[in-house]
């Protein structure tokens, strides 16, 4: 996470903090992974574009009984606290591909790191 350094100094909290915290949580999950994450549960792949946070939440919420990702679910809810409308929701998912939660987390992490580097904090 060296590219995410430099934000620990005092002073105004940048708008990137929520994104950085989410990235750090995903890093923790991937680094602490011993057995298959969430017992190898499968989730829908998503479009890593507009509405990504809501889409990621909608996909991961279908994994039950996996405490390892509950904090991630709640942090994603920070970006997407109220349900999107039915019209918006239909475009969030790619309902043709399922991947393991571990791969989903890795893909999401890579994309969020890219957004962070590019300064796209919301």
């Amino acid at each position: 996470l060296t590219c995410l350094g430099g934000f620990a100094s005092p002073g105004p909290v940048p708008p990137s903090t929520a994104l950085r915290e989410l990235i750090e949580e995903l890093v923790n999950i991937t680094q602490n992974q011993k057995a298959p994450l969430c017992n190898g549960s499968m989730v829908w792949s998503i479009n890593l574009t507009a509405g990504m946070y809501c889409a990621a939440l909608e996909s991961l919420i279908n994994v039950s009984g996996c405490s390892a990702i509950e904090k991630t679910q709640r942090m994603l809810s920070g970006f997407c606290p109220h349900k999107v409308s039915a019209g918006q929701f239909s475009s969030l998912h790619v309902r043709d591909t399922k991947i393991e939660v571990a791969q989903f987390v890795k893909d999401l992490l890579l994309h969020l790191k890219k957004l962070f580097r590019e300064g796209q904090f919301n």
Partner: antibody, heavy 118, light 111 residues
């Protein structure tokens, strides 16, 4: 330990304004959505406003255009600016951490009383 | 707006009793396999406390005597064996549609 402490309540005349504050501690404030929920004396609960970690705001029609929710992540603080106050806005106003539509409101402050009366 | 109707509005019970509170939504609050219904407990002069989220999930730290069930429009909060600290008012809340709405509350009193 998560703590939410509201302040700023008091007596205000109809048509007046008031700004409520909520000081948060014990969690990474900037990573979570926050809300205000109110409760009129002897009545039930009513959702008033929400703000996402990305500063998107949400309001019911009853307060839209009169109330503004905002946050200052540097100060770990949540605010509710209330304008054009009416008698029916009299209530205890609670600050709550919002863990989204799938998780509800897991943490609440103790509340601050707003009385709108002439 | 989705109307939430709780019943009964109040009830009297004794310590050890099994208590059931129901909440009926004016339209379904189900979404993608989840019921967006939550239950809170409130004691006089205190803030509400989350007990159950998504209809049946026990919030961390909440005693296992509390349970929730239901889907669609009909939901139930059950206290398997009422304890002295459970005398309070209970509210249901939906988050499926803005504005989020609460039920009118059910006051559980000592018989």
């Amino acid at each position: 330990e998560v703590q939410l402490v509201e302040s700023g309540g008091g007596l205000v005349q109809p048509g007046g304004s008031l700004r409520l504050s909520c000081a948060a501690s014990g969690f990474t404030f900037s990573s979570y959505a926050m809300s205000w929920v109110r409760q009129a004396p002897g009545k039930g609960l009513e959702w008033v406003a929400s703000i996402s970690s990305g500063d998107t705001t949400y309001y019911p029609d009853s307060v839209k255009g009169r109330f503004t929710i905002s946050r200052d992540n540097a100060k770990n603080s949540l605010y509710l600016q209330m304008n054009s106050l009416r008698a029916e806005d009299t209530a205890v106003y609670y600050c709550a951490r919002l863990d989204g539509y799938y998780f509800g409101f897991p943490y609440w402050g103790q509340g601050t009383l707003v009385t709108v009366s002439s | 707006d989705i109307q939430m109707t709780q019943s009964p509005s109040s009830l009297s019970a004794s310590v050890g009793d099994r208590v059931t509170i129901t909440c009926k939504a004016s339209e379904s609050v189900d979404h993608s396999g989840s019921s967006l219904m939550h239950w809170y407990q409130q004691k006089p002069g205190k803030a509400p406390k989350l007990l159950i989220y998504r209809a049946s999930n026990l919030e961390s730290g909440v005693p296992s005597r509390f349970s929730g069930s239901g889907s669609g429009t009909d939901f139930t909060l059950t206290i398997s064996s009422l304890q002295p600290e459970d005398f309070a008012t209970y509210y249901c809340q939906q988050s499926n549609e803005d504005p989020w709405t609460f039920g009118g509350g059910t006051k559980v009193e000592i018989k």
